[in-house]
Interface confidence: medium
């Protein structure tokens, strides 16, 4: 059986204050079943960033539609980006139970601000 | 109706600990970051500490950090703050504050619990 | 750290009178503005949020303007349960979250 992959391809992106960041994940497999997450830092400080299961998320989106069968493509999109933002973002797999398990974490991706042109 | 209700305060002596409680209803309590913010008597608003919906991410205001611990159940849906170390300049009114989005405004208050550091 | 300052401390106003609140924040916070309420020994409560947007059930008698370091918030007819401190706060860089050092509005 082949590994599963979590796939940030963009190891930094840079947005202007005020613009929209794509941040792409994929995975390799559909299987075994269970959610991604998104997280800013990591350890066991890390925020929660996006959880399509529940979570009040206003300005973050999914790229894809994450409840169509057989997706593999989890990236998001921040929108109204601020300096607040900065940070490396970790699109992270889990094992569906009670609770999930983490199972594997994409390499992460550095989301930098840089100050609106005037 | 979103209700955020705190307990817990009192009156202290400097170096001694506090645990405030700030129970939460009418919302999906494990949805959204919640903070602490205080109001020393006559001063405007500080904020004190903020904490991540899944409680993983937690910040602090220089002025405690090291000294007062943010956590939440989410199973209870009740929001803490523990204070040690506390000292004169601790003595506020602490009120819990739900924030809209994870990056965001306080869009609820409660209606605060006063701490009172004195010998 | 982004530093708000609220002027006037202090405003007294008629009732039916345009109160006018100034914050002017030390560097730029794009929208990410809100204005609170606190009445005397009452929690504050949210009025505007993304510097121009009114919260859920506050009259529209109250409206915020601005972007970058220059806000307004404005009471275009001062009821006298209008008589609060009035704070603004930035959520542009955090942490920490940071709030101006209020505006007084009495009244005459």
């Known amino acids: 059986e082949e590994e599963l992959q979590v796939i940030q391809p963009e190891k930094s992106v840079s947005v202007a204050a005020g613009d929209s960041a794509t941040l792409n994940c994929t995975v390799s497999s559909l299987i075994p079943v269970g959610p991604i997450q998104w997280f800013r830092g990591a350890g066991p400080g890390r925020e929660l960033i996006y959880n399509l299961k529940e979570g009040h998320f206003p300005r973050v989106t999914a790229v894809s539609d994450p409840t169509k069968r057989n997706n593999m493509d989890f990236s998001i999109r921040i929108s109204n980006i601020t300096p607040a933002d900065a940070g490396t973002y970790y699109c992270v797999k889990f094992r569906k139970g009670s609770p999930d398990v983490e199972l594997k974490s994409g390499a992460g991706t550095e989301l930098s601000v840089r100050a609106k042109p005037s | 109706d979103v209700q955020l209700v705190e307990s817990g305060g009192g009156v202290v002596r400097p170096g001694e600990s506090l645990r405030l409680s700030c129970a939460a209803s009418?919302?999906?309590?494990?949805?959204?970051?919640m903070n602490w913010v205080r109001q020393a008597p006559g001063e405007g608003l500080e904020w004190v500490s903020r904490?991540?919906?899944?409680?993983?991410?937690?910040d602090y205001a220089d002025s405690v950090k090291g000294r007062f611990t943010i956590s939440r159940d989410n199973s209870k849906n009740t929001l803490y703050l523990q204070m040690n170390s506390l000292r004169a300049e601790d003595t506020a009114v602490y009120y819990c504050?739900?924030?809209?989005?994870?990056?965001?405004?306080?869009?609820?208050w409660g209606l605060g619990a006063p701490v009172t550091v004195s010998s | 750290e982004t530093v708000l300052t609220q002027s006037p401390a202090t405003l007294s106003v008629s009732p039916g009178e345009r109160a006018t609140l100034s914050c002017r924040a030390s560097?730029?916070?794009?929208?990410?503005l809100a204005w609170h309420q606190q009445k005397p020994g009452q929690a504050p409560r949210l009025l505007i949020y993304?510097?121009?947007n009114r919260a859920t059930g506050i009259p529209d008698r109250f409206s915020g303007s601005g972007s970058g370091t220059d806000f307004t918030l404005t009471i275009s007819s001062l009821q006298t349960e209008d008589s609060a401190v009035y704070y603004c706060?930035?959520?542009?860089?955090?942490?920490?979250?940071?709030f101006g050092g209020g505006t007084k509005v009495e009244i005459k």
């Open positions: 504050a739900k924030q809209y989005d994870w990056n965001s405004f306080f869009d609820y």
């Open positions: 009418g919302f999906s309590f494990r949805s959204y970051a």
């Open positions: 904490i991540d919906s899944g409680g993983g991410g937690t």
């Open positions: 560097q730029t916070v794009g929208s990410k």
């Open positions: 993304d510097a121009s």
């Open positions: 706060q930035q959520y542009y860089y955090w942490p920490p979250y940071r």
